[in-house]
């Protein structure tokens, strides 16, 4: 029950996170005009990954797309790439995790397969979250650098009366949405990985049945071909005899439910 809850919660948290990453990527307010210590203008500038916008005090808003690829800063291209990679990985992760959910039965899917899928989706969510956090952080760093550069020459061309106010940009809402969304996706991924450990199949603890053949006492251990997820079932570093016979003198210790936690 706890495993199902953890998996379900991980899925929901990741879903919210990925929705947030998509929203942040599409948002226009990655950077917004810094209004502090600035002459009050009747226009408000803000920029996204795909277009820049100007909102006038009249209420009229005009947005212009970046219709060039080569003319854009490499950093902006990198941020775009990171966000898209994050979205793609997250979307695939969501698709995989839907089939991995314990509460959803698809044919005669083994628990081990579900565990593998849960782990895969968990890793995808973690990488997706990291991509989003990295993308947003790179953009934020770019903003901070540009902010201090423009502060250094806040007023340009001060020859005589004429002054040109340089527009400074600060963190926009999309950055915070991206950070939170990336964090949620990361947390969701970790939860999926934790749930995976609980989903890994337990070895069935059968009593050894003795077969007396030519004077030797041999015990047959069933279930030797059961697939291993690498979690839990081999945590004790035991030597597994796949389909092999074992003497009754050998002490067998099987992983209990508590070994997965």
């Amino acid at each position: 029950m706890a495993v199902t809850a953890c998996q379900g919660l991980g899925f929901v948290v990741s879903l919210i996170g990925i929705a947030g990453i998509i929203a942040a990527t599409c948002m226009d307010q990655w950077s917004t005009q810094d209004l502090y210590n600035n002459p009050v203008t009747a226009v408000f500038n803000y920029q996204g990954l795909w277009r820049s916008c100007v909102r006038e005090s009249s209420g009229f808003t005009e947005c212009r797309g970046y219709f060039t690829l080569l003319g854009l800063p490499a950093m902006l291209q990198a941020v775009r790439a990171l966000m898209i990679v994050g979205i793609v990985l997250g979307a695939i992760g969501l698709l995989v995790s839907i089939f991995a959910l314990k509460c959803i039965r698809i044919g005669s899917m083994e628990d081990s397969a579900k565990a593998n899928m849960t782990l895969t989706s968990g890793i995808m969510f973690i990488v997706s979250g990291l991509c989003a956090i990295a993308g947003v952080s790179v953009f934020a760093n770019m903003l901070v650098t540009n902010f201090w550069m423009s502060t250094a020459n806040m007023y340009t061309g001060m020859g005589g009366m004429v002054q040109t106010v340089q527009t400074r940009y600060t963190f926009g809402a999309a950055l915070f949405v991206g950070w939170v969304a990336g964090g949620l996706t990361l947390i969701g991924g970790v939860m999926m990985c934790i749930a995976c450990r609980g989903l890994a199949p337990e070895e069935t603890n059968y009593k050894a049945v003795s077969y007396h053949a030519s004077g030797h006492s041999v015990a047959y251990k069933p279930g030797g071909f059961k697939a291993s997820t690498g979690f839990g079932s081999n945590t004790k570093n035991k030597k597994i005899y796949d389909g092999g016979a074992r003497t009754e003198d050998e002490v067998q210790s099987y992983p209990s439910k508590h070994d997965y936690v």
């Epitope: 005009q33 002459p39 009050v40 203008t41 009747a42 226009v43 500038n45 803000y46 920029q47 820049s52 916008c53 100007v54 006038e56 005090s57 009249s58 209420g59 009229f60 005009e62 212009r64 004429v162 002054q163 040109t164 106010v165 340089q166 527009t167």
Partner: antibody
Framework: QIQMVQSGPELKKPGETVRISCKAS????????MQWVRKMPGEGLKWIGW????????KYTEDFKGRFAFSLETSASTTYLQISNLKNEDTATYFC???????????WGQGTSVIVSS | DIVMTQSPSSLTVTAGEKVTMSCKSS????????????LTWYQQKPGQPPKLLIY???TRESGVPDRFTGSGSGTHFTLTISSVQAEDLAVYYC?????????FGAGTKLELK
């Protein structure tokens, strides 16, 4: 078509209060703010301030803070300019104008003449 | 506040003549975000309210005859009337539409010879 219709001329004594109305028609009233401009005899145009139509929040320039007040009656698509404690130097023609694209005043009222005389 | 300086203060012209009037602002009215100059031109005829002619320094308002042309960038702006008509006799105001408070120039009065 878009129209701004202002109330008629006013003759007031110093210390009195005047209230000028500006009724808008031909567009959705709350989508655009309303500005007020003063033109004194023999002088140029001076911006008084503006009121945000959807929220009713007024913004005044420094020279007009205190005695000047904007208000809205959204249901009647009307904006008001009230000037209290009138002075002789308030004698002017007052215009209302709609905020337009490019931060312009795209449609103007016909103007309201206010004469302050004892 | 932004100071808008218009010159000349008055112009005496004959019908059909080309007219140019100037407007200078104390700060650049160019917005980097959309590369638009927030300067507006109005025409005010006697006994009438001002009429919007040009916004964004060079964009003609709909219904304005194409003999009116706005140009300039940053701090220096010009309004040109290619062939003056009798109905163009009025006072022309430029306005800063970028910084609060929005400020007007003193106006250029266009008179007929």
């Amino acid at each position: 078509q878009i129209q701004m219709v202002q109330s008629g001329p006013e003759l007031k004594k110093p210390g009195e209060t005047v209230r000028i109305s500006c009724k808008a028609s031909g567009y959705s009233f709350t989508t655009a703010g309303m500005q007020w401009v003063r033109k004194m005899p023999g002088e140029g145009l001076k911006w008084i301030g503006w009121i945000i139509a959807h929220s009713g929040e007024p913004k005044y320039t420094e020279d007009f803070k205190g005695r000047f007040a904007f208000s809205l009656e959204t249901s009647a698509s009307t904006t008001y300019l009230q000037i209290s404690n009138l002075k002789n130097e308030d004698t002017a023609t007052y215009f209302c104008a709609r905020w337009g694209k490019g931060n312009t005043m795209d449609y103007w009222g016909q103007g309201t003449s206010v004469i302050v005389s004892s | 506040d932004i100071v808008m300086t218009q010159s000349p203060s008055s112009l005496t012209v004959t019908a059909g003549e080309k007219v140019t009037m100037s407007c200078k602002s104390s700060q650049s009215l160019l917005n980097g975000g959309n590369q638009r100059n927030y300067l507006t031109w109005y025409q005010q005829k006697p006994g009438q309210p001002p009429k919007l002619l040009i916004y964004w320094a060079s964009t003609r308002e709909s219904g304005v005859p194409d003999r009116f042309t706005g140009s300039g960038s940053g701090t220096h702006f010009t309004l040109t009337i290619s062939s003056v008509q009798a109905e163009d006799l009025a006072v022309y105001y430029c306005q800063n539409a970028y910084f609060f408070p929005l400020t007007f120039g003193a106006g250029t009065k266009l008179e007929l010879k």
